[in-house]
């Protein structure tokens, strides 16, 4: 399965309406800083064979789209950026879902791979974890905003070298 | 390859202006913040500015506050530094300055540099 | 605002020989969040600053592997271990954790 070139031009947009949607300086958030421990190996893409690496982008992406769905999500950032950028994010899961049913036909997809689908949402449980705990602060949605970019930015990467694997 | 050029230091008198350049490239510029950092003849490093990634926001410290601005063109990768009511304590070579990705830890780590642009404010 | 205090020089140190650098902050650099917010950046004669260390104790992407730095909070040491001769040159400590951005005033290895 090729990944449509408008897929990673979906990521490339969705990370630039995620960082217009800051309604925060960061300076003023230095206190809140947090270490989510990105688990920075399921995004190496030698390590995969393409179906896992496509599962793994989804999971990502989804996990990325629930979290910005929410109620809570809702009041923290501008209704227009966050509907375009959920958007987006749709867009790509629907890309993604179409290659991992083509792929997984290819090939078996290892136990392996439930371990990094896990360690995303483990990921994502600790981001989460995090936004109650500082009762969803504007700082803490500034906090998570930087952090959601800089996994974006793995996954546009992780991405690129699925592309020179083809 | 990222690369970082600088342009548009030089003499000028006290009370003067002078813009700062630093064009960008081999990697996203939109999706960095940078930071300007200034040394001093007598070797010291000295923080001038910062901006993030959008351009949204920006912070300076005391020294340089309401006489610098930080800016920058995401379209044209190009990160500025207009400096204005120039004194001659800021005689110093300037460089512009990548911020490591940090995410959440907002790790500024400054992982890239330029090569520097001089900067002589006498009479 | 945090001050970063370094001695001028080194002391001499022989190619080959281990070499360690000092830096002490005004204030605890470890943050609630577990990280330390402390870098060490290298200044060659004629070049540009380049990052060596981030976050106290992680090496920077192609640095050397015979850097290393450790620290508690408040002072801080780099370490080189097998000096070499293209290791001349400033040594700069600095700290992330507050604004504004500071950086101590550097010291000079010095090769005997």
């Known amino acids: 399965c090729d990944l449509p070139q408008t897929h990673s031009l979906g990521n490339r947009r969705a990370l630039i309406l995620l960082g217009q949607m800051g309604r925060i300086s960061p300076f003023s958030c230095l206190k809140d800083r947090h270490d989510f421990r990105i688990p920075q190996e399921e995004f190496d893409g030698n390590q995969f064979q393409k179906a896992q690496a496509i599962s793994v982008l989804h999971e990502m992406i989804q996990q990325t789209f629930n979290l910005f769905s929410t109620e809570d999500s809702s009041a923290a950032w501008e209704q227009s950026l966050l509907e375009k950028f959920s958007t987006e994010l749709y867009q790509q899961l629907n890309d993604l879902e179409a290659c991992v049913i083509q792929e997984v036909g290819v090939e078996e997809t290892p136990l392996m791979n439930e371990d990094s689908i896990l360690a995303v949402r483990k990921y994502f449980q600790r981001i989460t974890l995090y936004l109650i705990e500082r009762k969803y602060s504007p700082c803490a949605w500034e906090v998570v905003r930087a952090e959601i970019m800089r996994s974006l930015s793995f996954s546009t990467n992780l991405q690129k070298r699925l592309r020179r694997k083809d | 390859e990222v690369q970082l050029q600088q342009s548009g230091g030089d003499l000028v008198k006290p009370g003067g202006s002078l813009k700062l350049s630093c064009a960008a490239s081999?990697?996203?510029?939109?999706?960095?913040?940078m930071s300007w950092v200034r040394q001093t003849p007598d070797k010291r490093l000295d923080w001038v500015s910062i901006?993030?990634?959008?351009?949204?926001?920006?912070y300076y410290p005391d020294s340089v506050k309401g006489r610098f601005t930080i800016s920058r063109d995401n379209a044209k990768n190009t990160l500025y530094l207009q400096m204005s009511s120039l004194k001659s304590e800021d005689t110093a070579m300037y460089y512009c300055?990548?911020?490591?990705?940090?995410?959440?830890?907002?790790?500024?780590?400054?992982?890239?540099w330029g090569q520097g642009t001089s900067v002589t404010v006498s009479s | 605002d945090i001050v970063m205090t370094q001695a001028a020089f080194s002391n001499p140190v022989t190619l080959g020989t281990s070499a360690s650098i000092s830096c002490r902050s005004s204030?605890?650099?470890?943050?609630?969040?577990?990280?330390?917010?402390l870098y060490w950046y290298l200044q060659k004669p004629g070049q540009s600053p380049q990052l060596l260390i981030y976050?106290?104790?992680n090496l920077a992407s192609g640095v050397p592997d015979r850097f290393s730095s450790s620290g508690s909070g408040i002072d801080f040491t780099l370490r080189i271990s097998r000096v070499e001769a293209e290791d001349v040159g400033a040594y700069y400590c600095?700290?992330?954790?507050?604004?504004?951005?500071?950086f101590g005033s550097g010291t000079k290895l010095e090769i005997k």
């Open positions: 300055a990548r911020h490591a990705e940090g995410g959440g830890n907002y790790d500024y780590a400054m992982d890239y």
């Open positions: 081999g990697f996203t510029f939109s999706s960095y913040g």
């Open positions: 901006i993030t990634s959008g351009g949204s926001y920006t």
């Open positions: 204030k605890s650099l470890l943050h609630s969040n577990g990280i330390t917010y």
């Open positions: 976050q106290m104790s």
């Open positions: 600095a700290q992330n954790l507050e604004l504004p951005f500071t």
